[in-house]
């Protein structure tokens, strides 16, 4: 058993059908010695008396808020949550497996640049009685500070007969050095509590691996005289690291017809302009990627040919 926060405790339970459970001793936080009784949640049934209460925690029915009283007055509370292990595996019931980029991916994180700021998000089908707490550091043995805000509900989606909720959190490395080579990964730890169930989820990554630039901005077309060709130009996104001479991007320019089946013409360039043939009803899209490290491409920025 360990303390999650004041008066909230997590019992780690290795569960199987006839498991003996975990013996837990609760102590009433009071100088009183006599006349103390214990109850669970809203029940008035007295579970025991004395300054300590010993319980056998076998299942969620044994978890909840234990209260010690004296003469009708509440002395202290202890909320017991369960962290359940089955077949040697800690439960992961609260969050959905996003299966990207691989199975058992519960947390996904992205950074728009090398500033040490990043966003993580996760999915759940649970709508109530749910809390998250996020901690992060660079490295784990001698951790360097990363500050995370509160997790917030960022999107709701309907998938078939199911509603899915997306939560996200923003974190910032306290002493980020954008140009430095990373040797220790960022660690992100999410504590999730649903009703009386505790679970924890972790992710470990280098900022360079989660970089996804914003789309190029100010995408413009300039027709070339007496030609079907156009000059496409764009700019680095505002959120990208500076100076651009050091933090350089490469770009992919795509001409896409109205029909998805039409052949796409693609051009790759390190410049912020390109000359392409603009077909009728086509659109021109540009996306960006770190020039020197193959992390994610940005989303597309698009303009119609007409």
């Amino acid at each position: 058993i360990w303390e999650l926060k004041k008066d909230v405790y997590v019992v780690e339970l290795d569960w199987y059908p006839d498991a003996p459970g975990e013996m837990v001793v609760l102590t009433c936080d009071t100088p009183e010695e006599d006349g103390i009784t214990w109850t669970l949640d809203q029940s008035s049934e007295v579970l025991g008396s004395g300054k300590t209460l010993t319980i056998q925690v076998k299942e969620f029915g044994d978890a909840g808020q234990y209260t010690c009283h004296k003469g009708g007055e509440v002395l202290s509370h202890s909320l017991l949550l369960l962290h359940k292990k089955e077949d040697g595996i800690w439960s992961t019931d609260i969050l959905k497996d996003q299966k990207e980029p691989k199975n058992k991916t519960f947390l996904r994180c992205e950074a728009k640049n090398y500033s040490g700021r990043f966003t993580c998000w996760w999915l759940t089908t649970i709508s109530t009685d749910l809390t998250f707490s996020v901690k992060s550091s660079r490295g784990s043995s001698d951790p360097q500070g990363v500050t995370c805000g509160a997790a917030t509900l960022s999107a709701e989606r309907v998938r078939g007969d199911n509603k899915e909720y997306e939560y996200s959190v923003e974190c910032q490395e306290d002493s980020a050095c954008p140009a430095a080579e990373e040797s220790l990964p960022i660690e992100v730890m999410v504590d999730a509590v649903h009703k009386l169930k505790y679970e924890n989820y972790t992710s470990s990554f280098f900022i360079r691996d989660i970089i996804k630039p914003d789309p190029p901005k100010n995408l413009q077309l300039k027709p070339l005289k007496n030609s079907r060709q156009v000059e496409v130009s764009w700019e680095y996104p505002d959120t990208w690291s500076t100076p651009h001479s050091y933090f350089s991007l490469t770009f992919c320019v795509q001409v896409q017809g109205k029909s998805k089946r039409e052949k796409k013409d693609r051009v790759f360039t390190d410049k912020t302009s390109a000359t392409v043939i603009c077909r009728k009803n086509a659109s021109i899209s540009v996306r960006a990627q770190d020039r020197y490290y193959s992390s994610s491409w940005s989303e597309w920025a698009s303009v119609p040919c007409s």
Epitope: W15, D41, F60, D93, T125, D161
Partner: nanobody, 123 residues
Framework: EVQPVESGGGVVQAGESLRLSCAAS????????MGWFRQAPGTEREFVAT????????YYADSVKGRFTISRDNAKNTVYLQMSSLKSEDTAVYYC????????????????WGQGTQVTVSS
């Protein structure tokens, strides 16, 4: 939300078998841990059995262990309770319930309840 609806109750002789079904409509059935409870006249609702969302783990009350089997078919949004070697003390209204906590024998840990189906075991 999920809405459980029980069926399959009836009158049987002691020692016979019966299978109860619980069809759940509404939200994704496979998100929920499912349980069976029962209530005899003048008594509190009593835990019978529960099964986890994947159907890979089950948990039973001592009074039914070895006689009752809980199972589920997520493709059919249905949970079953196979009852054998029935005794007169198994007479009760049987309720199907859906919740988020597995395993739990406590009724308040289940969020959605059916209306119940009567099982009468005559000796």
């Amino acid at each position: 939300e999920v809405q459980p609806v029980e069926s399959g109750g009836g009158v049987v002789q002691a020692g016979e078998s019966l299978r109860l079904s619980c069809a759940a409509s509404g939200r994704s059935f496979s998100d929920y841990e499912m349980g069976w409870f029962r209530q005899a006249p003048g008594t509190e609702r009593e835990f019978v059995a529960t099964i986890n969302r994947r159907g890979s783990s089950t948990y039973y009350a001592d009074s039914v262990k070895g006689r009752f089997t809980i199972s589920r078919d997520n493709a059919k949004n249905t949970v079953y309770l196979q009852m054998s070697s029935l005794k007169s003390e198994d007479t009760a209204v049987y309720y199907c319930a859906a919740g988020w906590l597995y395993p739990s024998s406590r009724s308040r840990d289940y969020d959605y309840w059916g209306q119940g189906t009567q099982v009468t075991v005559s000796s």
